[in-house]
Interface confidence: medium
């Protein structure tokens, strides 16, 4: 039950995270005009990964797409790439995790297959989240660098001008959406990986084999403990399956003197 909950929660958290990564990637407000020196500006500039916009005090908004690839900074291209890779991996992860959900029955899919798929989707979510966080962080770093460069120019290069046209840009809403979304996807991925450990079916690590002793029947029960007959070396109820660390052969390699195959 706890495994199903963990897996389901991991899926939902990752789903929200990936939706957030997509939203952040599409948003125009990656960098916004810093209004520190001009809080009542008539025009407000902001930029996204795909276009630049200006909003006027009247509410009139105008946006222009980036028509060129060559003139765009390599950093911006890298951020675009990271966000797209994050979305693609996240989307594939979601697809895989849907089939991996314990609450969904697809044909006669083994629990081991579901466990593997859960692990795969979990890893994909983790990488997706990391890509988004990396992309947003690279962009934020670019903004911080440019912000201080603009500040330096503003006070050194503008001479005795009465008003400057130097525009400084600061963090836009998309950066915060991206960081949160990346974090959620990462957390969802970790939850899927944890769920995978619980999903790995114990019964698949050995065969349920019946053993017969003279006059007594001895069986391996799915609980992981060898049923005791009351005599011999097995009176301690020795645990012979410890989390799948031993092979089926190892499990069966310690027969008591009363047992025969």
């Amino acid at each position: 039950m706890a495994v199903t909950a963990c897996q389901g929660l991991g899926f939902v958290v990752s789903l929200i995270g990936i939706a957030g990564i997509i939203a952040a990637t599409c948003m125009d407000q990656w960098s916004t005009q810093d209004l520190y020196n001009n809080p009542v500006t008539a025009v407000f500039n902001y930029q996204g990964l795909w276009r630049s916009c200006v909003r006027e005090s009247s509410g009139f908004t105008e946006c222009r797409g980036y028509f060129t690839l060559l003139g765009l900074p390599a950093m911006l291209q890298a951020v675009r790439a990271l966000m797209i890779v994050g979305i693609v991996l996240g989307a594939i992860g979601l697809l895989v995790s849907i089939f991996a959900l314990k609450c969904i029955r697809i044909g006669s899919m083994e629990d081991s297959a579901k466990a593997n798929m859960t692990l795969t989707s979990g890893i994909m979510f983790i990488v997706s989240g990391l890509c988004a966080i990396a992309g947003v962080s690279v962009f934020a770093n670019m903004l911080v660098t440019n912000f201080w460069m603009s500040t330096a120019n503003m006070y050194t290069g503008m001479g005795g001008m009465v008003q400057t046209v130097q525009t400084r840009y600061t963090f836009g809403a998309a950066l915060f959406v991206g960081w949160v979304a990346g974090g959620l996807t990462l957390i969802g991925g970790v939850m899927m990986c944890i769920a995978c450990r619980g999903l790995a079916p114990e019964e698949t690590n050995y065969k349920a084999v019946s053993y017969h002793a003279s006059g007594h029947s001895v069986a391996y029960k799915p609980g992981g403990f060898k049923a005791s007959t009351g005599f011999g070396s097995n009176t301690k109820n020795k645990k012979i399956y410890d989390g799948g660390a031993r092979t089926e052969d190892e499990v069966q390699s310690y027969p008591s003197k009363h047992d025969y195959v």
Epitope: N45, Q47, E56, E62, G71, P73, Q163
Partner: antibody, heavy 127, light 110 residues
């Protein structure tokens, strides 16, 4: 090189219509907004209309609103100004101008400038 | 109705400095109006000098400079030459996709 050439001007009677054209060359026409500006004889420049690079937005001066229509054909690299219900006060040299705000650098800035002008075409409204 | 005001005429001696201004009948001009300046000689199409307050257009000599002085946009010509004798127009972006030209200033280089 970057060039704009207006055509379609002439003498027309009041109340009649006329369509001006502006042929663009030497640049990616579809990436730029375009203006029409006019100048009455012996007077100053007057902004008439603007159209966005993709034709999504059109704005007009109050003096021509409802009578003039700006349009463009990006496949033909041509800007148009359809002038209806012409009046004597519409007599002027009509210039088309390119709106400059497309930069190759990031981030783009909106400069709201008219950087390239055509030589103009004369429209005379007279009975 | 917004009116953009300019001095109708101005005179300057060769080599002298002149500042042409561009104001609003109501309110003051700021960089948010993206003031730009155009030079027009009789019978010719206008030529862009300055845009976005203080950015010189390509090929424009550095004798021409733009700024905001007080509550007006300003075009300053230092070391005026005979061929600077022209009409000078400023245009302000009023927002919402509307531009308004000033009445123009006729500059005479005496």
């Amino acid at each position: 090189q970057v060039q704009l050439v207006e055509s379609g001007g002439g003498v027309v009677q009041p109340g009649r219509s006329l369509r001006l054209s502006c042929a663009a060359s030497g640049f990616t026409f579809s990436s730029y907004g375009m203006h029409w500006v006019r100048q009455a004889p012996g007077k100053g420049l007057e902004w008439v209309a603007v159209i966005w690079y993709d034709g999504s937005n059109k704005k007009y001066a109050d003096s021509v609103k409802g009578r003039f229509t700006i349009s463009r054909d990006n496949s033909k690299n041509t800007l148009y100004l359809q002038m209806n219900s012409l009046r004597a006060e519409d007599t002027a040299v009509y210039y088309c101008a390119r709106r400059y705000d497309v930069l190759t650098a990031y981030p783009y800035y909106f400069y709201y400038n008219m950087d390239v002008w055509g030589p103009g075409t004369t429209v005379t409204v007279s009975s | 109705q917004t009116v953009v005001t300019q001095e109708p005429s101005f005179s300057v001696s060769p080599g002298g400095t002149v500042t042409l201004t561009c104001g609003l009948n109501s309110g003051s001009v700021s960089t948010s109006y993206y003031p730009s300046w155009y030079q027009q000689t009789p019978g010719q199409a206008p030529r862009t000098l300055i845009y976005s307050t203080n950015t010189r257009s390509s090929g424009v000599p550095d004798r021409f400079s733009g700024s905001i002085l007080g509550n007006k946009a300003a075009l300053t010509i230092t070391g005026a030459q005979a061929d600077d004798e022209s009409d000078y127009y400023c245009v302000l972006y009023m927002g919402s996709g509307i531009w308004v030209f000033g009445g123009g200033t006729k500059l005479t280089v005496l």
